[in-house]
């Protein structure tokens, strides 16, 4: 008889999750030769150990510490790019500007990007049927706690001028409840981070408003300033042109504003 399995509201573990994590880990070490010391089997064992056999609504940051230790990486000062609600553009940017890094350009972020996973209490099985949804089930689920853990660490280790890409098309350009707003902002270290520079990405071609004056941006400025970190903001009116100019900065059209 099939064993009774808890039904959660979220989608189940991504198909071939172990193989995907292992393959991504190997690929990462190929693309980043300085990480060729990383034992991907040990990384997978640590990843698995964080959630297998554990009740998936009771995962802690401590569960992920062995994995975090194995995935230790440092980003050069001034090269950290945070993002909120605009992942694709942030990733397109770092694919062109190869010396800047989002969390998903780091090993652990790269391993888990767009994947879902969870286990079951007291069994060694991965649950491919359903996993807890952050809103409908619980916030301390394996995926949410993972991103909270690695996002915290990513912010803690940032130094120099930190950049953040924000989505100007959303009602809350800066959202206190996002990972950026609830975790990363509060874990930037004032003794290491001189400034946070926000890039507000405009959605409409004819949108010429100064979104740096948006109330939520002012709220972000207030939070950051209270933490003794300077704050700057830039409007990116034409994200397509912005990317094009990152690729070809010599282009004559790039001398004007973007």
């Amino acid at each position: 008889l099939p064993r009774w399995r808890q039904q959660w509201s979220g989608s189940g573990t991504t198909s071939r999750f172990p193989e995907t994590v292992l393959a991504r880990c190997v690929k990462y070490t190929e693309v980043h030769p300085e990480m060729r010391h990383v034992d991907c089997q040990s990384v997978w064992d640590a990843f698995k150990g964080a959630f297998i056999s554990k009740y998936p609504c009771n995962i802690t940051e401590e569960d992920y510490q062995p994995l975090v230790k194995l995935g230790t990486q440092t980003v050069p000062c001034n090269k950290t790019l945070l993002w909120s609600r605009i992942k694709d553009l942030a990733h397109q940017f770092t694919q062109v500007q190869r010396d800047m890094f989002t969390l998903e350009d780091m090993l652990l972020g790269y391993l888990a990007d767009d994947l879902t996973w969870c286990g079951e209490f007291n069994t060694f099985e991965i649950n491919y049927q359903s996993c807890p949804d952050w809103r409908k089930d619980c916030s301390n689920n394996p995926v949410s706690v993972f991103w909270k853990t690695v996002s915290r660490r990513f912010a803690e280790t940032a130094c120099g001028v930190v950049h953040v890409m924000l989505n100007g098309s959303r009602s809350k350009i800066f959202d206190k409840n996002s990972t950026f707003g609830s975790v990363e902002v509060h874990n930037l270290q004032p003794e290491k981070v001189q400034a946070l520079e926000a890039w507000v990405i405009h959605g409409g071609r004819e949108d010429s408003r100064d979104l740096c004056q948006d109330p939520t941006i002012k709220e972000l400025e207030s939070i950051i300033s209270k933490r003794n970190i300077r704050f700057f903001c830039k409007n990116i009116y034409r994200p397509d042109k912005f990317l094009q100019c990152v690729k070809n900065p010599e282009d004559s059209s790039c001398l004007s504003g973007i």
């Epitope: 172990p18 193989e19 190997v26 060729r36 991907c40």
Partner: antibody, heavy 119, light 111 residues
Framework: QVQLLESGGGLVQPGGSLKLSCVAS????????MNWVRQAPGKGLEWIGK????????NYTPSLKDKFFISRDNAKNTLYLQMTKVRSEDTALYYC????????????WGQGTTLTVSS | EIVMTQSPASLSASLGQRATISCRAS??????????VHWYQQKSGQPPKLLIY???NLESGVPARFSGSGSGTDFTLTIHPVESEDVATYYC?????????FGSGTKLEIK
């Protein structure tokens, strides 16, 4: 860039001992598994063994287990191969090689140092 | 231990043609995720150089005319088109379990 430089080879009498060295540069030696591989004249490659970053795990090919001893000194970025009770069949070019642990492949090799066993 | 049997021992190929080298393992060297077989090129007087890792992945800097395939026990290295600089001995190697072992090598010559 990554470099591995072996030294210490030479002429040794049967039954004698010799210690080979491999100095690493261009990467963080203390993070990597390292290997010794040998090649007899005109022959193929034979894996000798490997050592993990903190020297807590050392594996050998069974036929050489009690005769060859691998060690390392991370402070000196150096890998060692202590060879004892050598015989003529140990005459070979000895390579150190870095293990790309995620794949199990050897991604960097030294130029090799030659051991000749002869009376 | 797993024995890697390579064939042929030597191979003569024309410039621009296809050269195929086979390697057979005495037992499976694959897991659910990977096949732990690697291919090396050794030119005369030089150390081996990693060409292909995990059966089919091209090491960075290696020309795309080299390719690898196979799973389980049977693996192939293909060079197409063959160029004069490809004259070398090619070795397969497994890292599925200890001890690691190599094939006996295939010497590639140009016709």
């Amino acid at each position: 860039q990554v470099q591995l430089l072996e030294s210490g080879g030479g002429l040794v009498q049967p039954g004698g001992s010799l210690k080979l060295s491999c100095v690493a540069s261009g990467f963080d030696f203390s993070l990597y598994w390292m290997n010794w591989v040998r090649q007899a004249p005109g022959k193929g490659l034979e894996w000798i063994g490997k050592i993990n970053p903190d020297s807590s795990t050392i594996n050998y090919t069974p036929s050489l287990k009690d005769k060859f001893f691998i060690s390392r000194d991370n402070a000196k970025n150096t890998l060692y191969l202590q060879m004892t009770k050598v015989r003529s069949e140990d005459t070979a070019l000895y390579y150190c090689a870095r293990l790309w642990i995620a794949t199990g492949g050897f991604d960097y090799w030294g130029q090799g140092t030659t051991l000749t066993v002869s009376s | 231990e797993i024995v890697m049997t390579q064939s042929p021992a030597s191979l003569s190929a024309s410039l621009g043609q296809r050269a195929t080298i086979s390697c057979r393992a005495s037992s499976s060297v694959s897991s659910s995720a990977f096949s732990y077989v690697h291919w090396y090129q050794q030119k005369s007087g030089q150390p081996p150089k990693l060409l292909i890792y995990l059966a089919s992945n091209l090491e960075s800097g290696v020309p795309a005319r080299f390719s690898g395939s196979g799973s389980g026990t049977d693996f192939t290295l293909t060079i197409h088109p063959v160029e004069s600089e490809d004259v070398a001995t090619y070795y397969c190697h497994h890292s599925r379990e200890l001890p690691f072992t190599f094939g006996s090598g295939t010497k590639l010559e140009i016709k």
